[in-house]
């Protein structure tokens, strides 16, 4: 059986401030069993953005029903984007255990934030 791959199809995504950003991630197998986590950045200072298993992430929602056992789509939507959200986001598969251990990471999606479009009212 082929080893699970974590696929982040978009190398980059650009979103206007105040909008929502959709970050796509799918896995190619249900094995090994274990949760998905999303991080911003890499290395020791990487920031946890979403943990499928636990935690409170008020601006993040899953695009599909990620709790369904057969689900292989772990895309997320981040609401009310601000310039502080810019960065590279990684979808990471963990292997179930005590504790769960990192199994494989996606290649990352770079999120850039455009200025909110200004609305000019023209008076005639």
């Amino acid at each position: 059986e082929e080893e699970l791959q974590v696929i982040q199809p978009d190398k980059s995504v650009s979103v206007a401030a105040g909008e929502s950003a959709i970050l796509h991630c799918t896995v190619t197998s249900l094995i090994p069993v274990g949760p998905i986590q999303w991080f911003r950045g890499a290395g020791p200072a990487r920031e946890l953005i979403y943990n499928q298993k636990e935690g409170h992430f008020p601006r993040v929602t899953t695009v599909s029903e990620s709790t369904k056992r057969e689900n292989m789509d772990f895309s997320i939507s981040i609401s009310n984007i601000t310039p502080a959200d810019a960065g590279t986001y990684y979808c990471v598969k963990f292997r179930k255990g005590s504790p769960d251990t990192e199994f494989k990471s996606g290649a990352g999606t770079e999120l850039s934030v455009r200025a909110k479009p200004s609305h000019h009212h023209h008076h005639h």
């Epitope: 020791p44 200072a45 946890l48 990192e102």
Partner: antibody, heavy 122, light 107 residues
Framework: EVQLVQSGAEVVKPGASVKLSCKAS????????MHWVKQAPGQGLEWIGA????????TYNQKFKGKATLTVDKSASTAYMELSSLRSEDTAVYYC???????????????WGQGTLVTVSS | DIQMTQSPSSLSASVGDRVTITCRAS??????LNWLQQKPGKAPKRLIY???SLDSGVPSRFSGSGSGTEFTLTISSLQPEDFATYYC?????????FGGGTKVEIK
């Protein structure tokens, strides 16, 4: 109780290399980044780099690239730092310390090894 | 790299004194700052993480405050066991950097 136990003091000749070890016990080794910190005699603390045992991912302070090489042996729950082409300015105490696999505030640099003194002398 | 400028580099104080040590970051690090205490011949010991959260077992006379680029460690009433060197450390981005240290000596 979490413990980081480092190897003993080393006296090495200029130009030689030395490999220091840091053995972790009391918690899951792979869930943490292992960091190394230098303290020259009478000086402050300098971060050298860190390694993530799950996949041996490393990150280095540019200043120590080419000087320090970080490795791990997961089966032995041990991290290693090899220092090469040693010079007198590499004389220092080297500490290992750790942080969680993501940037959980409470897990940054709370546990430290006792330090290993490396003396470079001809 | 983020530079951490700590002041003063040393100070003399008496038991019971209130002591304040400051750390300035060269760019915004949010609240991602630790304060460490080190005694001669020993490994550093973390006192405070995330700017103001006290580690377990650390006396309440130690407190931390600040955010962004300006941070403070305060010892409200200095005790004999507090004479040591104190370092700030930013862990917002790699390479992680320490302040130069503040040596607190007996007056």
């Amino acid at each position: 109780e979490v413990q980081l136990v480092q190897s003993g003091a080393e006296v090495v000749k200029p130009g030689a290399s030395v490999k220091l070890s840091c053995k972790a016990s009391g918690s899951t080794f792979t869930s943490y980044w292992m960091h190394w910190v230098k303290q020259a005699p009478g000086q402050g603390l300098e971060w050298i780099g860190a390694i993530y045992p799950v996949n041996s991912d490393t990150t280095y302070n540019q200043k120590f690239k080419g000087k320090a090489t970080l490795t791990v042996d997961k089966s032995a729950s041990t991290a290693y730092m090899e220092l090469s082409s040693l010079r007198s300015e590499d004389t220092a105490v080297y500490y290992c310390t750790r942080s969680f696999y993501y940037s959980l505030d409470a897990a940054w640099f709370v546990y430290w090894g006792q330090g290993t003194l490396v003396t470079v002398s001809s | 790299d983020i530079q951490m400028t700590q002041s003063p580099s040393s100070l003399s104080a008496s038991v019971g004194d209130r002591v304040t040590i400051t750390c300035r970051a060269s760019q915004d690090i949010g609240s991602r700052l630790n304060w460490l205490q080190q005694k001669p011949g020993k490994a550093p010991k973390r006192l405070i993480y995330a700017t103001s959260s006290l580690d377990s077992g650390v006396p309440s006379r130690f407190s931390g405050s600040g955010s962004g680029t300006e941070f403070t460690l305060t010892i409200s009433s200095l005790q004999p066991e507090d004479f040591a060197t104190y370092y700030c450390l930013q862990y917002a981005s790699s390479p992680f950097t320490f302040g130069g240290g503040t040596k607190v000596e007996i007056k």
